[in-house]
């Protein structure tokens, strides 16, 4: 059977696959997924290995019309480096010479300057080019190679291995060489895979059942360290509770060098955040950190300095800590908007079982603002999801020049932020450079400010506007209000009406359903429309909602189903990637972010049309 990294190299014009008959004869044959001689896989960013021979595709020279055969894999050889050129061409790196079918006289696969159909190759059984099944480096653990990546294939006791092996071991632990010749270089590490005993790579906190992996012998950049954790279904460490910090201080007490954790300020427009999306609510900075020097966007825990945190340049090479298992966050169920009949007093706005009100004109210090909210039967607002934040920004009349108190503060326990209404902290969205918690100005309270409504810590004695929130009072069945300019069941936002399509549909079916309603699959023009849509669908239990974006028409170029320019994007991490498809909005922890899915997957969707009686603004000129 093919493992997910392996593929057959298919030429559509001849309907045949590449076949490594011998190291000196790489030809074609009728495709057969069971034939080892037809299986290939990427073993580095640019090398393709024959699974049967554990040798790499290469050429004797970078010249036109030479035979492509198999060679001992050598990551330094210029003659084994391949790259995908536009669409389905595979070429030798840096040259306009392509992997070619050969001809009637020449049975072997050839290197050729022509880029016609005989030089076009796909992964058999798909429409994808060979690079879509690209190489993913596997970072090792322990061993003696400082966490370097596996080098496949590698030689051990004169035998070649294209995968992790337990050779030389009686306990089944899987390892790999980190250079192609273990016998000479003696460099290796254990593979980040599941095998009997691999749980001893982790330390489990008996109190929380969360597991931690301390990789003190590794030397990786922050991004490499994160990748290594993710390869083990884990993430770089986040610390949200004082107990967790105490446990880790003990776990790392015998070490001296810094270890990467998940804290970073890599997001262009927001502040400090954990890579696993935990809220940044507990601070344990080393005195003098975080330093404001540009580029110091990643954070290490310093065992030698009482496990306090320091921001560094992300390209530094350090050890790292991974975390997996139950999150340390208290479970806190946020009701979906649709589940809760929400009735609010006049001037309060309903959302997901609560009522909200902005007090902009009567400026108050935080303590007095809190008193006022409590007198009104509520509290300073807590915010538990991106959807709730986006509701406040897009539907509560929030303005970009606002600076408003919210309920977050660290008055009770310094450097440990809590909501004034006592609900757990499950979400934070700090402004760039925040929380700064400048010690010379006790910044114990938190405001929402700026166009995105992100947060900053602030001295509590400033008179500012504030946002109150209270539980709504349920009064029997909810009255469905018909919004002006929109049909029943549609929701109005600015000039448009929106409706959730409740039948699970493919992209094409969803598009047709919207068209039948004299509407179209939603476009998203800017941050504010995105905020509205996130609050509209984000709390719903379904995982995805189709938007009108896809690259069906031109692979690699995403377009809306209606003739409108793509002026705003909100991609999830690793998106859009190389895969063609249709774009859906995520819900849950990644609420509102865009993922590329196969267009024939089934999801719910959002339709959109102009509200009646609205004058269309002129199209922006470019």
């Amino acid at each position: 059977l093919l493992d997910t990294r392996q593929f057959l190299i298919y030429n559509e014009d001849h309907k045949r696959c590449v076949d490594a008959v011998s190291p000196s004869a790489v030809q074609t044959a009728a495709c057969n997924q069971d034939a080892e001689s037809q299986k290939f896989r990427w073993v580095s960013e640019s090398q393709i290995m024959s699974v049967a021979f554990k040798l790499c595709l290469g050429v004797p020279s970078k010249t036109d019309w030479v035979a492509i055969t198999l060679y001992a894999c050598d990551s330094k050889s210029e003659f084994q480096k391949w790259e995908c050129k536009n669409d389905t061409l595979l070429g030798i790196k840096g040259e306009d010479l392509f992997f070619n079918y050969g001809n009637r006289q020449e049975k072997n696969i050839m290197l050729y300057k022509g880029s016609g159909l005989w030089s076009r190759w796909k992964i058999y059984g798909t429409t994808d080019n060979l690079c879509s099944r690209g190489y993913e480096a596997m970072y090792t653990l322990l061993g003696n190679a400082n966490g370097a990546t596996c080098a496949f294939p590698f030689k051990f006791e004169n035998k070649w291995y294209a995968d992790c092996t337990s050779a030389g071991r009686s306990d089944g632990w899987l390892w790999c060489g980190t250079t192609t010749d273990y016998d000479t270089d003696k460099l290796f590490g254990y593979c980040p895979l599941k095998f009997e005993g691999s749980e001893s790579l982790w330390n489990k906190d008996p109190l929380t059942s969360v597991s931690y992996q301390i990789n003190s012998k590794s030397a990786l950049t922050w991004h490499q360290a994160r990748k290594s954790c993710q390869q083990q279904n884990a993430e770089l460490l986040s610390i949200t509770e004082i107990h967790e910090q105490t446990y880790l201080t003990g776990l790392t007490s015998s070490l001296t060098s810094g270890l990467w954790i998940g804290l970073n300020s890599l997001s262009f427009n927001s502040g400090w955040q954990w890579s696993d999306r935990s809220p940044f609510r507990y601070l344990n900075w080393l005195p003098g950190s975080p330093s404001a020097e540009p580029g110091k966007s990643c954070v290490s825990l310093n065992p030698g300095k009482n496990a306090k945190w320091e921001n560094l340049e992300c390209v530094q090479k350090l050890g790292y800590i991974c975390k997996k298992g139950n999150t340390t966050l208290n479970s806190f169920v946020i009701p979906s908007e649709s589940d809760v009949p929400t009735h609010c007093p006049s001037q309060w706005w309903p959302y997901a079982g609560h009522c909200y009100k902005i007090h902009r004109d009567e400026k108050k210090i935080q303590r007095d603002a809190l008193t006022t909210c409590r007198k009104e039967g509520g509290d300073l607002t807590s915010i538990h999801t991106i959807e709730e934040l986006d509701f406040i920004i897009s539907q509560l009349g929030y303005e970009p020049n606002d600076e408003l108190w919210i309920g977050l503060n660290d008055i009770k326990i310094q450097m440990y932020f809590e909501w004034s209404d006592g609900t757990p902290v499950t979400f934070t969205k700090w402004l760039r450079g925040e929380p700064s918690h400048e010690n010379n100005r006790q910044e114990d309270c938190v405001v929402m400010k700026g166009k995105d409504g992100y947060w900053a810590d602030r001295g509590c004695e400033w008179p500012l506007g504030y946002i109150c929130k209270m539980k709504s009072r349920s009064q029997g069945p909810e009255i469905v209000e018909v919004e002006k300019g929109c049909r029943k069941g549609w929701k109005k936002h600015h000039f448009y009406c929106y409706m959730i399509g409740h039948t699970l549909s493919t992209f094409a079916e969803a598009n047709q359903t919207c068209n039948n309603e004299n509407a179209y699959l939603t476009t998203i023009e800017d941050r504010y429309e995105q905020a509205f849509l996130t609050s509209f669908v984000g709390l719903r239990p379904e995982k995805y909602f189709w938007t009108g974006l896809s690259d069906i028409q031109t692979k690699g170029t995403f377009q809306w189903t209606i003739e409108e320019e793509v002026r705003f994007t909100h991609w999830n991490s690793d998106m859009p990637g190389r895969k063609p498809g249709c774009v859906a909005m995520r819900t849950g922890i990644a609420g509102g972010l865009w993922d590329v899915l196969k267009c024939d997957e089934k999801a719910k969707f959002v339709c959109k049309h102009w509200a009646e009686g609205v004058t269309h603004p002129p199209k922006p000129t470019t």
Partner: nanobody
Framework: DVQLVESGGGLVQPGGSLRLSCAAS????????MGWYRQAPGKQREEVAA???????NYADSVKGRFTIPRDNARNTVYLQMNSLNPEGADVYSC?????????????WGQGPLVTVYS
């Protein structure tokens, strides 16, 4: 490198008892298992008893009920408590540790103390 230091071998009467110990040291991340093997002159080496890091034990049929294999995790040490010894002559008992260390090879062997049962 991993070193195994064994001790406790000697002469013992039939029916008597003896306790062997084996301590592992060196650049060890974890010990997945430790065990005792014996080899009589002119015979194949056979496993007597083994214990995994999780505490699972395994005994050869010939020693069940007479031998035990306690382990001290903190000291990376395993013992072999031998009771009701049979007059089987002079056997060499060797200790083996299955370790995760700085080479991919897992098995480290000790030199083996001699146990002689005389009648």
């Amino acid at each position: 490198d991993v070193q195994l230091v064994e001790s406790g071998g000697g002469l013992v009467q039939p029916g008597g008892s003896l306790r062997l110990s084996c301590a592992a040291s060196g650049s060890i991340f974890t010990i997945n298992a430790m065990g005792w093997y014996r080899q009589a002159p002119g015979k194949q080496r056979e496993e007597v008893a083994a214990i995994t890091s999780g505490g699972r034990t395994n005994y050869a049929d010939s020693v069940k009920g007479r031998f035990t294999i306690p382990r001290d995790n903190a000291r990376n040490t395993v013992y072999l408590q031998m009771n009701s010894l049979n007059p089987e002559g002079a056997d060499v008992y060797s200790c083996k540790a299955v370790v995760v260390t700085t080479t991919p090879y897992s098995d480290s062997w000790g030199q083996g103390p001699l146990v002689t049962v005389y009648s």
